[in-house]
């Protein structure tokens, strides 16, 4: 009876996500058969989050709306370890929007999910950010310094990275 009600709950939770994510990849968390963490297929997972590399070229605002439709946001990078995981799935000759912007052009950078911007946990390329008109952040590869952030114009289409919390069922 207990297992039956647990299964019913799981099925109803899965139905919630089915509209945007018809397929989920789930793994058992720990030793308890009842705890599963899932990411939409073919998203990748790291710690408590799921990530999706969008290869369509869109403006920053459109990229954020696109992530939002999938129940996600443009990626908020909180640690060096998280960035190191993300870059494994990126192409060196491409640039990808982050969920970081400065809409007022006053160097008040803000993350899309309201995570406080911490100057100590940023990975700007040297000399960046460098232009008050460039109000959105990308991550890209420079041969001299590997992967890092750069400020660019928000209206210019780029690839992007979406991030969402893992789905627990």
């Amino acid at each position: 009876n207990f297992m039956y009600s647990k299964t019913v709950k799981r099925l109803s939770k899965l139905r919630e996500y089915q509209q945007y994510h018809p397929s989920l990849t789930c793994v058992m968390e720990g030793k308890d058969i009842e705890d599963w963490s899932c990411c939409p297929t073919p998203w990748t997972s790291f710690q408590s989050s799921c990530y999706f590399i969008s290869t369509g070229m869109q403006s920053w605002t459109k990229s954020q709306k696109n992530c939002s439709v999938m129940g996600a946001d443009l990626v908020v990078i909180n640690t060096r370890e998280e960035q190191d995981f993300i870059i494994q799935n990126l192409k060196r000759n491409s640039s990808y929007f982050l969920g970081l912007s400065d809409p007022g052009g006053r160097r008040h950078w803000q993350w899309v999910d309201q995570t406080p911007y911490n100057e100590n946990v940023t990975f700007w390329h040297s000399g960046e950010p460098n232009n008050l008109d460039e109000r959105c952040a990308i991550i890209n590869f420079r041969s001299s310094e590997e992967w890092g952030w750069n400020d660019i114009h928000c209206h210019v289409p780029q690839k992007s990275i979406c991030k969402m919390k893992k789905i627990y069922i």
Partner: antibody
Framework: EVQLVESGGGLVKPGGSLRLSCAAS????????MSWVRQAPGKRLEWVAT????????YYPDSVKGRFTISRDNAKNSLYLQMNSLRAEDTAVYYC??????????????WGQGTTVTVSS | DIVLTQSPASLAVSPGQRATITCRAS??????????MHWYQQKPGQPPKLLIY???NLESGVPARFSGSGSGTDFTLTINPVEAEDTANYYC?????????FGGGTKVEIK
């Protein structure tokens, strides 16, 4: 007073080239993104090219990509548009315009008087 | 590309009356309360002149009889009251994404 003065327009045969110039004064030219916008007779305005303030980025619509090149010389307060492989549909008045960024986009707050380009055999 | 459709194509208004021009975008040009739609006036033989930026902000030096409103996909430029010197073409422009695009224009004539 902000002033933008275009020059270099004229009559050119299809396949020919032309270089437009825009002399800027009355503002710190190097601090602004600049664009070229054109208007064919009786048609809507059409964006042609943009160059960022720091000269780092140039952008073009597909209709001119590979044929037109925008450049700037901040020391001379000048903006340029090199137009190659010209076609009849490039016939228009070409305006130089200053960009002002606002939030995630921008608008054109000052425009030159325009220079006329006619492509005809 | 975002397509901007202006209506009407032309408009004849008596001095002292109100003129209303609409611009409809093929997709939203708004994001988090910012509306990236702008309006220009172009008189014959002259370059465009900025009137309104970000949907409702009056450019410095532009008479207060010009006003703008709207959000998402639907925007309006209002001239109230119209004066004889307002005879011109009026264009909307979006800048939320490249390429920046312009509406087809509305010709305003004074009766």
């Amino acid at each position: 007073e902000v002033q933008l003065v275009e020059s270099g327009g004229g009559l050119v045969k299809p396949g020919g080239s032309l270089r437009l110039s825009c002399a800027a004064s009355g503002f710190t030219f190097s601090s602004y993104g600049m664009s070229w916008v054109r208007q064919a007779p009786g048609k809507r305005l059409e964006w042609v090219a943009t160059i960022s303030s720091g000269d780092s980025y140039t952008y073009y619509p597909d209709s001119v990509k590979g044929r037109f090149t925008i450049s700037r010389d901040n020391a001379k307060n000048s903006l340029y548009l090199q137009m190659n492989s010209l076609r009849a549909e490039d016939t228009a008045v070409y305006y130089c315009a200053r960009q002002l960024y606002y939030s995630y986009g921008y608008y054109f707050d000052y425009w030159g008087q325009g220079t006329t380009v006619t492509v005809s055999s | 590309d975002i397509v901007l459709t202006q209506s009407p194509a032309s408009l004849a208004v008596s001095p002292g009356q109100r003129a209303t021009i609409t611009c409809r975008a093929s997709e939203s040009v708004s994001f988090h309360g910012t509306h990236l739609m702008h309006w220009y006036q172009q008189k014959p033989g002259q370059p465009p002149k900025l009137l309104i930026y970000a949907a409702s902000n009056l450019e410095s030096g532009v008479p207060a009889r010009f006003s703008g409103s709207g959000s998402g996909t639907d925007f309006t430029l209002t001239i109230n009251p119209v004066e004889a010197e307002d005879t011109a073409n009026y264009y909307c422009q979006q800048s939320i994404e490249d390429p920046p695009t312009f509406g087809g224009g509305t010709k305003v004539e004074i009766k």
